[in-house]
């Protein structure tokens, strides 16, 4: 019963993680313009994402532009896109596998097979979480590095956008969900080691407790 509850919790967290990843990857809020210094009336704020960039005027008007050429994009952006898409597909696969092996479903009858399926789902979700974490951490590292690099002009300095924070949260949820699914898997039954097939039985250890005097330090 407790394992069913853990399974449900794990899957719920994973679903939230998947939704968070979807929103994080889709929103153009990975990098936001950093206006450093005082006495500046900001005329516009630039938002940059994996698929588009937006310019928000002080009037509130927003103009977004989808990146044109795939080949002209920086390699790190292309890699981030790919990792996000793979993570989303992988997390979706993990959830489908988890549902298949869940205690509350009858897709698989064998309990042992169910446990293995749920364990597999947990591993897949953990992997998906790691895949989300890679582009998010990489981008955050690049932003921070540029922010403190004196050779990067102020016009090019950026701050961490909301998508990155959401990405971290989503990765945590996916990994937590995956971890819980891995935990629900019961440990394999430790079988009593069978002695050699001899014609006589091995005498039991001395002492009422079954412990030998050598077991005491």
């Amino acid at each position: 019963m407790a394992s069913t509850g853990l399974e449900l919790l794990g899957m719920t967290l994973a679903v939230l993680g998947w939704l968070g990843t979807l929103v994080s990857c889709a929103l153009p809020l990975w990098k936001v313009t950093a206006f450093i210094g005082n006495s500046i009336v900001v005329a516009q704020v630039v938002w940059e994402g994996l698929w588009m960039s937006c310019v928000v005027q002080s009037t509130g008007q927003m103009q977004c532009k989808v990146y044109d050429s795939l080949l002209a994009l920086p390699q790190d952006l292309q890699a981030a896109r790919a990792l996000c898409v793979i993570a989303l597909l992988l997390a979706l696969l993990g959830l489908l596998v988890a549902i298949t092996g869940a205690q509350c479903t009858t897709c698989v009858e064998d309990e042992g097979a169910k446990a293995r399926i749920v364990l597999t789902a947990g591993v897949i979700l953990l992997l998906a979480g790691i895949l989300v974490l890679i582009p998010v951490c990489w981008t955050a590292h690049a932003i921070i590095q540029d922010f403190y690099n004196p050779l990067v002009a102020e016009a090019l300095k950026r701050e961490l956008g909301a998508s990155l924070y959401l990405g971290w949260a989503a990765a945590a949820l996916l990994m937590l969900g995956g971890g819980l699914l891995c935990c629900t898997c019961p440990p394999p039954q430790v079988e009593r080691p069978r002695g050699p097939r001899l014609g006589y039985s091995i005498p039991s250890r001395s002492g009422a407790s079954g412990l030998d005097k050598r077991d005491y330090v």
Epitope: N149, L151, E154, A155, L156
Partner: antibody
Framework: EVQLQQSGPELVKPGASVKISCKTS????????RHWVKQSRGKSLEWIGT????????RYNQKFKGKATLTVDKSSSTAYMELRSLTSEDSAVYYC?????????????WGQGTSITVSS | DIQMTQSSSSFSVSLGDRVTITCKAS??????LAWYQQKPGNAPRLLIS???SLEAGVPSGFSGSGSGKDYTLSITSLQTEDVATYYC?????????FGGGTKLELK
Amino acid sequence: EVQLQQSGPELVKPGASVKISCKTSGYTFTENIRHWVKQSRGKSLEWIGTINPNNGETRYNQKFKGKATLTVDKSSSTAYMELRSLTSEDSAVYYCTRGITKSPYGMDYWGQGTSITVSS
Amino acid sequence: DIQMTQSSSSFSVSLGDRVTITCKASEDIYNRLAWYQQKPGNAPRLLISGATSLEAGVPSGFSGSGSGKDYTLSITSLQTEDVATYYCQQYWSTPPTFGGGTKLELK
């Protein structure tokens, strides 16, 4: 007192290369980035490029890529600029400057300038 | 690249005059503007950074103002030692660019 001491004037032949130096004193060499600026006779100022003395990282004006190479020697607190394949267009006064600490692409201290004359 | 335009390349002035030199950027430079003074045979000298901040040792007769794309350098009362060429420079984006310069000449 912050000082940027540049090497003396140079008269070079077309096609040749020249390396000018900029020795700094009066502050920690690695704390500020170093810029190089060109001023042709009677003309305005043009930014050539910049170097971070901490790690040797450089940024160049597209116009001077392949023309100028910036380097530093931390042990002697000296910045260098090498200009290659010189033509009469490269005849100018070249300045090394120090980037403002909080706004590195502003320039608070300037060397006295090095005059380069390209002539056969 | 951001273009910096100093509308007057030269100015005929008299001692004691109030002088105003203007500089216009091709796009918003968010006050990332410096003013330099250059006398013949010398290197430029930084007068003002951040559009309005006077550097140490610069006479209080100099002042900077402006925001967005338009900036101004003012000299309240022109002295002999102020006769020079003045350059503006944006350091908002790379490459940093300079104005063409405004030369002050005595009448």
